[in-house]
């Protein structure tokens, strides 16, 4: 008893965030095919016509490639074969983002899966105590972020307390004209207190934290992706 | 292994065609793993790249010399060519043809050994 | 276009030195750069690409660091024929732009 056609493959994607300016990775994983003649990989962006990456008998194809991704593109080539048809994307620009389609056609049979890429730019913020000021205060610093976050300021020992007025934020643009460079300044803080900077866009979330003692300043810092 | 050797007149006279062609040897042009560029060095000076190519012609030009290039790729005799127009004596250099490592790192290697042109009346 | 700056452009060294030359990028490449090594009527050739990656067939003296837009060659004991000039080239975006180039002659 035969089946006509070939069979459906689980094609799997996940949702991720580039930070422009840097490189980035579109994830997807298919059933593995040992056969890596008969395995077609095709990366396309929906509005675009062409193609952002073709990879196909053991080979990169991009004779149908639009121009806005020449030169930026890769499949991690030695990985096909075990199921791996993640796509590497050089110099994230804020235009890659967008829902991507990853297709794959192998002996087994052909499938596909959508992914959603967001891009911005977010960096890990910098606690520093600032001895310039009349009165002790922390300068958090975040070097590129877009689009423009929110920051808000947190304490262990107040907690739930809003520091809105005993702080200021201020947004500076960088050179190429896109990210900016986050500075806010905490006033009025106390002794052995740990304080926290946070940053959040709708693309990452970032915190840096300080802990400010007579005889020592600790710091930490994380960078969360959002919706990953 | 693969093996780039540029060809072409080692004399252009001003305001002509400077036309040149780079034979592969040892691999395939139609390889998609690869891009096909052209570079030039002014002489005792440093490195300037021209432009690449894709086997199936598609084509990325420095905007510097845009308006005065065409690159166009000959599969069936494994070769690329790089023609530029109006040339002057600024245009005398040593001309390299390159592959790049793959599709995302162009970085170049190999290099053809180079072949000298002189733009002189 | 991205701007590549080599530092310093002439460097006078002796057999077994360490030797370090820098590249400097107007802005951002990431890890995008390549050293090659140039001698004269030759061709360059290849030594180090994605900033820290050894080209095959290159010796092991050679080494590559650095991201961003700051970026160092370092041969940790010169030998008598790798005096020669050597060029940084970015290519992390069109147009590829290479450095002035660094001439590493004999002290």
């Known amino acids: 008893f035969g089946i006509s056609g070939k069979h459906f493959i689980t094609v799997t994607t996940f949702t991720s965030a580039g930070n422009i300016g840097e490189d980035g990775t579109l994830s997807c994983t298919f059933e593995p095919d040992i056969k890596l003649n008969g395995i077609v990989i095709q990366w396309l962006k929906e509005g675009i016509k062409g193609l952002v990456h073709e990879f196909k008998e053991g080979k990169d194809d991009l004779s149908q490639q639009h121009e806005m991704f020449r030169g930026r593109t890769a499949v991690f080539a030695d990985q096909v074969v075990v199921g791996n048809a993640s796509l590497r994307l050089k110099n994230v620009q804020l235009t890659d983002a967008g829902t991507y389609t990853c297709y794959i056609r192998t002996s087994k049979g052909k499938g596909n899966a959508n992914l959603e890429y967001k891009t911005g730019a977010f960096s890990m913020p910098e606690i520093n105590v600032d001895y310039n000021a009349s009165s002790e205060s922390l300068r958090c610093e975040a070097p590129r972020w877009f689009p423009q976050p929110t920051v808000a300021w947190a304490s262990q020992v107040d907690q739930g307390a809003n520091f809105s007025e005993v702080s200021n934020t201020s947004f500076e643009l960088n050179s190429e004209n896109v990210t900016m460079k986050v500075v806010s300044v905490l006033y009025n803080v106390t002794i052995n207190n740990t304080y926290s900077c946070m940053i959040e866009n709708d693309i990452a979330k970032a915190t840096g934290d300080i802990k400010v003692t007579d005889s020592e300043v600790k710091r930490r810092s994380q960078l969360q992706l959002l919706n990953s | 292994q693969v093996q780039l050797q540029e060809s072409g007149p080692g004399l252009v006279k001003p305001s002509q065609t400077l036309s040149l062609t780079c034979t592969v040897s040892?691999?395939?042009?139609?390889?998609?793993?690869?891009?096909w560029s052209w570079i030039r060095q002014h002489p005792g000076k440093g490195l300037e790249w021209i432009g690449n190519?894709?086997?199936?012609?598609?084509?990325y030009y420095n905007p510097s010399l845009r308006s005065r290039v065409t690159m166009s790729v000959d599969t069936s005799k494994n070769q690329f060519s790089l023609k530029l127009s109006s040339v002057t004596a600024a245009d005398t250099a040593v001309y390299y043809c390159?592959?790049?490592?793959?599709?995302?790192?162009?970085?170049?290697?190999?290099w053809g050994q180079g072949t000298l042109v002189t733009v002189s009346s | 276009d991205i701007q590549m700056t080599q530092s310093p452009s002439t460097l006078s060294a002796s057999v077994g030195d360490r030797v370090t030359i820098t590249c400097r990028a107007s802005?951002?490449?990431?890890?995008?750069l390549a050293w090659y090594q140039q001698k004269p009527g030759k061709a360059p050739k290849l030594l180090i690409y994605e900033a820290s990656s050894l080209h095959s067939g290159v010796p092991s003296r050679f080494s590559g660091s650095g991201s961003g837009t700051e970026f160092t060659l370092t041969i940790s004991s010169l030998q008598p024929d790798d005096f020669a000039t050597y060029y940084c080239?970015?290519?992390?975006?069109?147009?590829?732009?290479f450095g002035g180039g660094t001439k590493v002659e004999i002290k």
């Open positions: 190519i894709y086997y199936s012609g598609s084509t």
């Open positions: 802005k951002s490449i990431s890890s995008w």
């Open positions: 040892g691999g395939s042009i139609s390889d998609g793993s690869y891009y």
């Open positions: 080239q970015q290519d992390n975006s069109y147009p590829y732009t």
């Open positions: 390159a592959r790049g490592l793959s599709t995302i790192d162009e970085a170049f290697d190999p």
